[in-house]
């Protein structure tokens, strides 16, 4: 950022006659920094904050206005001021924001709007942290708002933080929101998603659950293989290796449907590579893809179910008909 004198360095000079601001309006854009300091009352500024954003104040004029608010509210701004900060929010430091108590989702939206189109700044991260902690959990409306502004938000949370996400909030999650999630995060999110979507019919269920499957256990993948889901290779490649290894050739063939041919292109990459090495060559040959596994005919299984799955029951109860 440009080097500039701190607002506190603006000389404390008397306001020239006739220049005392009676309201926050456009005429103030022609005031020098020292005139703003001298002629704009901080209390007036606080009560008319909603006007500031509509007026094209310069970068350095905004520094002065921030300084005035800081002097008026040394312990932190009240929410009535915060919700109308507009572009002044860009001037706030994480230290400033830690003094705030933001409880209204509307306030959060207003401030995120200011930063729209930019990466998540330390200021925004601090604001979100303060807001979520104040709420106690990441409820659906908040998650909806945050992922709308920052699709990668969910994946920036630790597994511990994700554990506070209620299953109902999962409805707000879009596939692109999970693009940067690692397996540990998906391990936490998958059971919540399965719970959230459990009453959907089969084909709709798969569409919704697909982006969470990186956290699915073997048992759930086996259940899906019975439902003609035609999982694409991109989704398959994101599955947990330990969940894929126990699957039989027949199960993988059913899981992928017409996409099974894509295994050849991925045979050197995990989890396909590791899965191939676990299969009998005879079984692999049934796919007709020229996949080279181990020559032996013995098939080892190491079941590592981390989740107790009720997926078979769901499908059975709903008597789902799957259509490709």
């Amino acid at each position: 950022d440009a080097a500039q004198p701190a607002a506190s360095e603006v000389e404390k000079t008397a306001c020239p006659s006739g220049k005392k601001a009676r309201e926050i309006d456009e005429s103030l854009i022609f005031y020098k920094k020292w005139e703003l300091e001298a002629c704009v009352d901080a209390a007036l500024l606080a009560t008319q904050m909603d006007r500031v954003n509509a007026i094209p104040f310069t970068y350095e004029q905004l520094d002065v206005l921030k300084h005035k608010l800081d002097e008026l509210y040394p312990q932190g701004y009240p929410e009535s001021v915060i919700q109308h900060l507009g572009y002044l929010f860009l001037k706030m430091s994480p230290e400033d924001i830690r003094k705030w108590n933001v409880t209204s989702l509307e306030t959060l939206k207003a401030l995120l709007e200011v930063n729209k189109g930019h990466e998540m700044s330390p200021q925004v991260a601090t604001l979100i942290d303060r807001f979520v902690k104040g709420r106690g959990q990441l409820d659906k409306d908040t998650l909806d708002t945050l992922t709308a502004f920052y699709p990668g938000y969910l994946c920036s949370l630790s597994p511990e933080e994700l554990s506070s996400v209620p299953p109902s909030s999962i409805w707000a999650v879009r596939p692109q929101d999970l693009d940067t999630c690692d397996p540990r995060q998906l391990d936490v999110l998958y059971p919540k998603a399965r719970l959230a979507f459990q009453n959907m019919n089969g084909s709709e269920y798969f569409v919704k659950i697909q982006s969470f499957l990186g956290g699915a256990p073997t048992e759930d993948l086996k259940a899906l293989s019975q439902q003609n889901v035609s999982m694409d290779l991109a989704t398959f490649m994101k599955l947990r290796t330990d969940a894929v290894l126990p699957l039989t050739v027949a199960e993988v063939q059913k899981l992928l449907g017409p996409h099974v041919e894509g295994l050849k292109a991925e045979e050197r990459h995990r989890p396909v590579r590791d899965w191939i090495l676990r299969q009998r060559q005879d079984d692999l040959d049934t796919l007709g893809l020229g996949l080279q596994g181990t020559r032996g005919s013995h098939h080892h299984h190491h079941h590592e179910f981390r989740h107790d799955s009720g997926l078979n029951d769901i499908f059975e109860a709903q008597k789902i008909e799957w259509h490709e």
Epitope: A2, F30, A54, P56, T58, Y59, E60, Q61, L90
Partner: antibody, heavy 122, light 107 residues
Framework: QVQLVQSGAEVRAPGASVKISCKAS????????IHWVRQAPGQGLEWMGI????????AYAQKFQGRVTMTRDTSTSTVYMELSSLRSDDTAMYYC???????????????WGQGTLVTVSS | DIQMTQSPPTLSASVGDRVTITCRAS??????LAWYQQKPGKAPKLLIY???SLASGVPSRFSGSGSGAEFTLTISSLQPDDFATYYC?????????FGGGTKVDIK
């Protein structure tokens, strides 16, 4: 693509008024400020004022105060600039241009209209 | 108001030349300075903003530098398309003000 399309050339007698339009397209009208800048024949650029299409707030350079009025119509994404009490030295090309609505660090004029020539002559 | 003074007013140069234009402000404008190119009968076009940031679609032969009260626009290797008039503009404070322009013509 971003476009600012201005109304056509105007000829006015001294003392009359002229109203020029600037129609915006290709961007969110309410997220930008619209400035008016003029250029007399063979001369440099002179800033006249600014309008916020979102709230309608406006500010005029002191030189034009009392003679200029900037308005907007959000339904058609159009901004207007009216200059009254015209004199011969108001003969110039008048441009509208936009700047992003921001924290003050972006008041450079990134897109300009094609200009409207106003000739003041008796 | 902040006065912006450009020099030289006119500059004669040849294709391939390195060209430098100077802009001085009557007071500190920090880095809040833009440069524009204008061709006859056309509207100005943004080249540089925030003293040194290249506007979208502008060739990299254009560069800007400076802060405070003194700024320069440099064209590293003048091309036929670059013969035009160049203006600086400060946006440190209102009213926004422009330099008087520098006309770059063919030597």
């Amino acid at each position: 693509q971003v476009q600012l399309v201005q109304s056509g050339a105007e000829v006015r007698a001294p003392g009359a008024s002229v109203k020029i339009s600037c129609k915006a397209s290709g961007f969110t009208f309410r997220g930008y400020y619209i400035h008016w800048v003029r250029q007399a024949p063979g001369q440099g650029l002179e800033w006249m004022g600014i309008i916020n299409p979102s709230g309608g707030s406006r500010a005029y350079a002191q030189k034009f105060q009392g003679r200029v009025t900037m308005t907007r119509d959000t339904s058609t994404s159009t901004v207007y600039m009216e200059l009254s009490s015209l004199r011969s030295d108001d003969t110039a090309m008048y441009y509208c241009a936009r700047t992003a609505s921001c924290g003050g660090d972006c008041y450079y004029l990134d897109y300009w209209g094609q200009g409207t020539l106003v000739t003041v002559s008796s | 108001d902040i006065q912006m003074t450009q020099s030289p007013p006119t500059l004669s140069a040849s294709v391939g030349d390195r060209v430098t234009i100077t802009c001085r402000a009557s007071e500190n404008v920090n880095i809040w300075l833009a440069w524009y190119q204008q061709k006859p009968g056309k509207a100005p076009k943004l080249l540089i903003y925030k003293s040194s940031s290249l506007a979208s679609g502008v060739p990299s032969r254009f560069s800007g530098s400076g802060s405070g009260a003194e700024f320069t626009l440099t064209i590293s290797s003048l091309q036929p398309d670059d013969f035009a008039t160049y203006y600086c503009q400060q946006y440190q404070s209102y009213p926004l003000t422009f330099g008087g322009g520098t006309k770059v013509d063919i030597k």
